[in-house]
């Protein structure tokens, strides 16, 4: 024999103070004749929530057309929900009856509770640049969601991460909790453009997660490479000498000539030029006038890059009338 | 006058998702207390009731079909849809949508659209 | 599922006949009964709502009784325009069912 089925579909309902909460009830049958009644809770003490025959419920609506004969839909959405309407709902059918309706069938009740979103979680890089090759934590946080389940996943440039830790505070029973968590990331020199994202997943954000980025241009240095090289042109009385320093973030560079020892005030041309991945190159002119000197020319290309130590390039004109050989040689 | 129209491919191959839609003029989609639902019927065969969608969103369908089978409204288009997915030859069949009006009873239906699954 | 099972399969019968036919439900559906008339390459078409109920432009001489399990459609006159396949309905349960059908034709 068929027999009347009460659904209500979700076990658990989350609701956030302010909204409507929508409670679904359907039924599998039109018989036995008699109405549904929507209460919390169960027993004696159970309190009624919705009556479609009589009473008032200023904050409750139907879904569906009940004065519809053959209305299988009883679910109710109720308005302005506060923290008093956690609890569990449950549908019944009614027989009806003489000289009252006798309750026939209860649905198996959603449970009302109340759920917080996540605020905006907030990623956090080093104090200090790193170069590559080294690892590096960023921490991503976000506060105020309920209940405590949540899943947060790190990525880099849109592959998933593995190395971090996690943590919910408290890890008792609280109205809100917070989550923290630490990923640890292997630089590369070619991560000036790259990005951190925090990906975070809470029932409340109904499958649509919060993310929060870091972008590893303000964690990365990339150290210069450098280059001192002679045209093998000469202008009369001048040599042409370049100084090249390559692949190098942030831009912040210091760059000055010495000759012989002694440090070069005057102007030199340069210039700087952005690379695909984010990394800059600049290059230097320096003229060296060779027109009444004897004796070797040794030139010094140094570069101050972001507070660091300083880094140095030499090159040694050997002056003859013929130009003899060039030779060079990096100090640190 | 509220009038049903049927739409979709006439032919779908097994294992694929058999989708039609039926578009509602003459009057809102969106209006209660109406009901909305498809019918089919097998060559030769009688009625079998596959779904119904309520006005407000709630979803009933046939229990033998219920794996398969998704009714869904479009209120902006003035439509609603059948999607009924790994068909086999047993899914050849007129696919009739129709409404329910406040009385019981599908008062009015579209002329059907036959669908044969078949590779 | 509840079984409707409509008799007889088919009947031929004279213009201005009373031609009736039933429809037995396998278990108790109040009086929540539909019933439709099919023309060949039609759709079906609403005659009877909740068992004795005439549908909105429908002819008088279509009417229905019945109420739990057992219940008769009766068509009081027989008209040419009235060969076609009749089905019964239950919606008192999910899911819906209809008989198997009563073709009626004219003698």
């Known amino acids: 024999e068929e027999e009347l089925q009460m659904i209500q579909p979700e076990k658990l309902l989350l609701v956030t103070v302010g909204k409507t909460a929508t409670l679904h009830c359907t039924v599998t049958s039109l018989l036995p004749v008699g109405p549904v009644l929507w209460f919390r809770g169960v027993g004696p003490g159970r309190e009624l929530i919705y009556n479609q025959k009589e009473g008032h419920f200023p904050r409750v609506t139907t879904v569906s057309d009940l004065t519809k004969r053959n209305n299988m839909d009883f679910s109710i959405r109720i308005s302005s929900i506060t923290p008093a309407d956690v609890g569990t709902y449950y549908c019944v059918k009614f027989r009806k009856g003489s000289p009252e309706n006798v309750e026939f069938k209860s649905g198996p009740g959603t449970e009302m509770a109340l759920g917080a979103k996540p605020s905006a979680p907030v990623v956090l890089g080093p104090a200090a640049r790193t170069t590559p090759e080294h690892t590096v934590s960023f921490t991503c946080e976000s506060h105020g969601f309920s209940p405590r389940d949540i899943t947060l996943k790190w990525f880099k440039n849109g592959n998933e991460l593995s190395d971090f830790q996690t943590n919910v505070d408290p890890t008792g029973q609280s109205v809100a909790y917070s989550i923290r968590s630490t990923a640890r990331v292997v630089l590369d020199p070619w991560d000036v453009r790259s990005q951190v994202i925090c990906e975070v997943a809470h029932v409340t954000l109904q499958g649509d997660p919060l993310r929060g980025t870091a972008n590893l241009s303000e964690a990365i240095r990339v150290p210069p490479t450098l280059e001192v090289t002679q045209q093998p042109m000469r202008v009369g009385n001048q040599v042409n000498v370049t100084c090249q320093v390559r692949k190098f973030y942030p831009q912040s560079l210091q760059l000055t000539w010495s000759e012989n020892g002694n440090v070069c005030q005057r102007e030199t041309a340069s210039t700087l030029t952005e690379n695909k991945d984010g990394t800059y190159n600049w290059t230097s002119w320096f003229l060296v006038n060779i027109s009444d000197q004897r004796d070797d020319v040794v030139l010094t290309c140094q570069v101050k890059h972001d507070g660091q130590l300083a880094v140095s390039k030499r090159l040694a004109l050997e002056v003859t009338v013929h130009q003899k050989d060039q030779s060079s040689d990096a100090t640190p | 006058q509220v009038q049903l129209q049927e739409s979709g491919p006439g032919l779908v191959k097994p294992s694929q998702t058999l989708s039609l839609t039926c578009t509602v003029s003459g009057g809102s989609i969106s209006s209660g207390p109406a009901y909305w639902s498809w019918i089919r019927q097998h060559p030769g065969k009688g009625l079998e009731w596959i779904g119904t969608i309520y006005y407000s969103g709630s979803t009933f369908y046939n229990p033998s079909l219920k794996s398969r089978v998704t009714i869904s409204v479009d209120t902006s288009k003035n439509q609603f849809s059948l999607k009924l997915s790994s068909v086999t030859a047993a899914d050849t069949a007129v696919y009739y949508c129709?409404?329910?009006?406040?009385?019981?009873?599908?008062?009015?239906w579209g002329q059907g659209t036959t669908v044969t699954v078949s590779s | 599922d509840i079984q409707m099972t409509q008799s007889p399969s088919s009947l031929s019968a004279s213009v201005g006949d009373r031609v009736t036919i039933t429809c037995q439900a396998s278990?108790?559906?109040?009086?929540?009964l539909n019933w439709y008339q099919q023309k060949p390459g039609k759709a079906p078409k609403l005659l009877i709502y909740?068992?004795?109920n005439l549908a909105t432009g429908v002819p008088s001489r279509f009417s229905g009784s019945g109420s739990g399990t057992d219940f008769t459609f009766t068509i009081s006159s027989l008209q040419p325009e009235d060969i076609a396949t009749y089905y019964c309905q239950q919606f008192a349960y999910l899911p819906w069912t209809f008989g198997g059908g009563t073709k009626v034709e004219i003698k």
């Open positions: 129709a409404r329910e009006g406040y009385h019981s009873g599908m008062d009015v």
């Open positions: 278990q108790d559906i109040s009086n929540y």
């Open positions: 909740d068992a004795s």
